[in-house]
């Protein structure tokens, strides 16, 4: 629970707690903002981001954004609050332990985004459909 000597709320700046009233600690995410990338036509890629940050807010999750246009490929790694849109998209998969890329419609470029909620989960970005939980073999592995 929140220690009694820690102020619980001032100026609406709440201390985030879990369902049991314990202080919710933030997760760790790769956080290199936008970097050029060589990740292309692969089932999965490592971020090659050397910076692991403690997210600023306990409710934030890890996000990765892969973009390809006529000139270059970039990979963005950040923390972000899933209640807020990112690049105008809702983080639908924020509770996932893995960062499984989903394509989003953006004019003039190929745009994939994923979010996840385990430490440094945006270090390994997954494009392959075989990682989708609709795959019955994967479900079998999960429940064994």
């Amino acid at each position: 629970t929140i220690p009694p000597h820690v102020q619980k709320s001032v100026n609406n700046d709440m201390i985030v707690t879990d369902n049991n009233g314990a202080v919710k600690f933030p997760q760790l995410c790769k956080f290199c903002d936008v970097r050029f990338s060589t990740c292309d036509n692969q089932k999965s890629c490592m971020s090659n981001c050397s910076i692991t940050s403690i997210c600023e807010k306990p409710q934030e999750v890890c996000v990765a954004v892969w973009r390809k246009n006529d000139e270059n490929i970039t990979l963005e790694t950040v923390c972000h609050d899933p209640k807020l849109p990112y690049h105008d998209f809702i983080l639908e998969d924020a509770a996932s332990p893995k960062c499984i890329m989903k394509e989003k419609k953006k004019p003039g470029e190929t745009f994939f985004m994923c979010s996840c909620s385990s430490d440094e989960c945006n270090d390994n970005i997954i494009f392959s459909e075989e990682y989708n939980t609709s795959n019955p073999d994967l479900l079998l592995v999960i429940f064994q």
Partner: nanobody, 122 residues
Framework: EVQLLESGGGLVQPGGSLRLSCAAS???????QMWWVRQAPGKGLEFVS?????????YYANSVRGRFTISRDNSKNTLYLQMNSLRAEDTAVYYC???????????????WGQGTLVTVSS
């Protein structure tokens, strides 16, 4: 009984340095994940730094990266935070905290010290 006792806070000028200590007792210090967490006046908690055990991997918030260094001395049961290039916005009560998984996925036992006040002002 688990106890965490912070020390080393005080008044320092902008650009100055301080070293905080957290003396731990009542548990096996060398096996625990340890954190420094701060609370500025009128603000919520900010999670500044974490050090894991075993391995001693360290992590920082973007706001302190390159200025603060977390370390531990398991033989002395003590956690440290070396704070350099201090700024007015670093003014806060600094707590050390330990986290241990309960065994139930995603849940933890937390223990907190009483905190030490750091004031950065000219």
């Amino acid at each position: 009984e688990v106890q965490l006792l912070e020390s080393g806070g005080g008044l320092v000028q902008p650009g100055g340095s301080l070293r905080l200590s957290c003396a731990a007792s009542g548990f096996t210090f060398g096996t625990e994940q340890m954190w420094w967490v701060r609370q500025a006046p009128g603000k919520g908690l900010e999670f500044v730094s974490r050090i894991d055990s075993p391995g001693g991997r360290t992590y920082y918030a973007n706001s302190v990266r390159g200025r603060f260094t977390i370390s531990r001395d398991n033989s002395k049961n003590t956690l440290y935070l070396q704070m350099n290039s201090l700024r007015a916005e670093d003014t806060a009560v600094y707590y050390c905290a330990k986290r241990r998984p309960t065994g139930v996925s995603g849940t933890f036992y937390d223990y907190w010290g009483q905190g030490t006040l750091v004031t950065v002002s000219s």
